[in-house]
């Protein structure tokens, strides 16, 4: 009887051991499959994120292109209209000019003396920039770069005058501290007679022959 029971117990142990072993194998296989599924999901997630990002960037690019296209179209139609007009006033800003509050602005990249810059603007049916407000000052500062830049303000004929006749005394001013000093020590038969934006945007008077950048301004027809 005893030996029979012992035999059955041994058989049960073996069966259980086999069951445990096979279960362990199955659990391991399932776990491995689960890991693979997790990895696949992660890979799919990152692929999806990348595609979403790419789409978003493409969308942004497309929007920019559309905006630029609309702007170019407007500019082109405006210039065609201008060609039919008598050209006395600008109905739109020329190519490479920037529009701000009804005026067109052109920012030079090279350097010229104040008289040369003044002549250049006149040949473009414009004048050296006249700053009428803090807002216009900010706009110019934003676009001019960290370089001395001529404006349409001079005292070569005596008092400080804006080239377009805007009243200097009552108008906007943004001089650096202790400027203008109209320094006479340079021996040029006059003081520092021309005003420029310094690299921080504030104004300084300097020798008019210095090779600085410049900004041209032209009025745009307010009716359009």
């Amino acid at each position: 009887q005893n030996s029979k029971l012992r035999g059955e117990l041994q058989a049960l142990r073996e069966t259980f051991s086999n069951f445990t072993a096979s279960t362990e194998v199955e659990v391991k296989a399932l776990s491995s499959q689960g890991g693979n599924v997790g990895r696949k999901m992660k890979s799919l997630e990152s692929q999806l994120e990348k595609q979403q990002k790419d789409l978003s960037e493409d969308h942004s690019d497309l929007l920019l292109h559309v905006k630029q296209f609309v702007s170019d179209l407007r500019s082109l139609s405006c210039q065609i209209a201008a060609l039919h007009g008598n050209g006395s006033t600008l109905t739109c800003c020329p190519v490479n000019w920037l529009e701000y509050e009804g005026s067109c602005y052109w920012f030079s990249r090279s350097g010229k003396s104040w008289p040369e810059a003044d002549k250049y603007c006149q040949l473009e049916s414009a004048h050296l920039v006249v700053v009428n407000s803090r807002e216009e000052q900010k706009f110019i500062q934003h676009h001019m770069g960290p370089v001395n830049t001529w404006m349409g303000l001079t005292d070569q004929s005596g008092p400080w005058k804006w080239v377009d006749g805007t009243d200097y005394e009552t108008g906007f001013k943004n001089w650096r501290p202790e400027q203008p000093d109209d320094w006479y020590g340079h021996g040029l038969g006059g003081g520092e007679d021309c005003a420029h934006f310094t690299d921080d945007g504030r104004w300084n008077d300097d020798v008019c022959q210095r090779p600085y950048r410049w900004v041209c301004e032209a009025a745009r027809d307010p009716a359009t």
Epitope: R109, S110, S113, V147, H186, L188, G189, Q209, R210, P211
Partner: antibody, heavy 120, light 107 residues
């Protein structure tokens, strides 16, 4: 420390071309104007060309206008001088020099120079 | 172009002497003038800018003055290392132009 090192000099026949380089280190190259100045044997200094900090403005001495081209690569901190149609009178030591500002403020740092000899 | 005239073209001096070099321009240049020192076989070294401002690291025995068309470089007490050629240069406008140089020799 601030350093400018010229290279590319040598002996060249009249009418031929040469390209000088100037490697800059020790300062933020892209914020300074750069110049080339030359000195013929036994003579004084002669300014050759300037390029502004961003490459937007270039000016040349009348003696080299139309033959020499100044350029820069701010990503490589390098200044160049392309010299075409070389003449005997272009024989000199060529120095690159840093402008004190963007390109109109005078020279402060100089390289050691590279010699260009134009001879047949 | 702005012409630069330096004088004298050469001078002999002794250690300890006070030396003055002058530079005259063909038109007014404000104070946009620099002075350089060059020793044989070496690159020029910047001494002064804006006519009277000393470059960093340059000893105070060097001083500059003038504006307009007339400028001077002064070495208050000449030392052996100061024997060299000195150049003035205008940078008011392009083309930048140099003076012909002044050679300072030992007496």
């Amino acid at each position: 420390q601030v350093q400018l090192v010229e290279s590319g000099g040598g002996v060249v026949q009249p009418g031929r071309s040469l390209r000088l380089s100037c490697a800059a280190s020790g300062f933020t190259f892209s914020t300074y104007g750069m110049h080339w100045v030359r000195q013929a044997p036994g003579k004084g200094l002669e300014w050759v060309a300037v390029i502004w900090y961003d490459g937007s403005n270039k000016n040349y001495a009348d003696s080299v206008k139309g033959r020499f081209t100044i350029s820069r690569d701010n990503s490589k901190n390098t200044l160049y001088l392309q010299m075409n149609s070389l003449r005997a009178e272009d024989t000199a030591v060529y120095y690159c020099a840093r402008d004190q500002g963007v390109g109109y403020d005078g020279l402060d740092v100089w390289g050691q120079g590279t010699t260009v000899t134009v001879s047949s | 172009d702005i012409q630069m005239t330096q004088s004298p073209s050469s001078l002999s001096a002794s250690v300890g002497d006070r030396v003055t070099i002058t530079c005259r321009t063909s038109q007014g240049i404000g104070n946009y003038l620099a002075w350089f020192q060059q020793k044989p076989g070496k690159a020029p070294k910047s001494l002064l800018y804006k006519a009277s401002s000393l470059q960093s690291g340059v000893p105070s025995k060097f001083s500059g003055s003038g504006s307009g068309t007339d400028f001077t470089l002064t070495i208050s007490s000449l030392q052996p290392e100061d024997f060299a050629t000195y150049y003035c240069q205008q940078y008011m406008t392009y083309p930048l132009t140099f003076g012909g140089g002044t050679k300072v020799e030992i007496k």
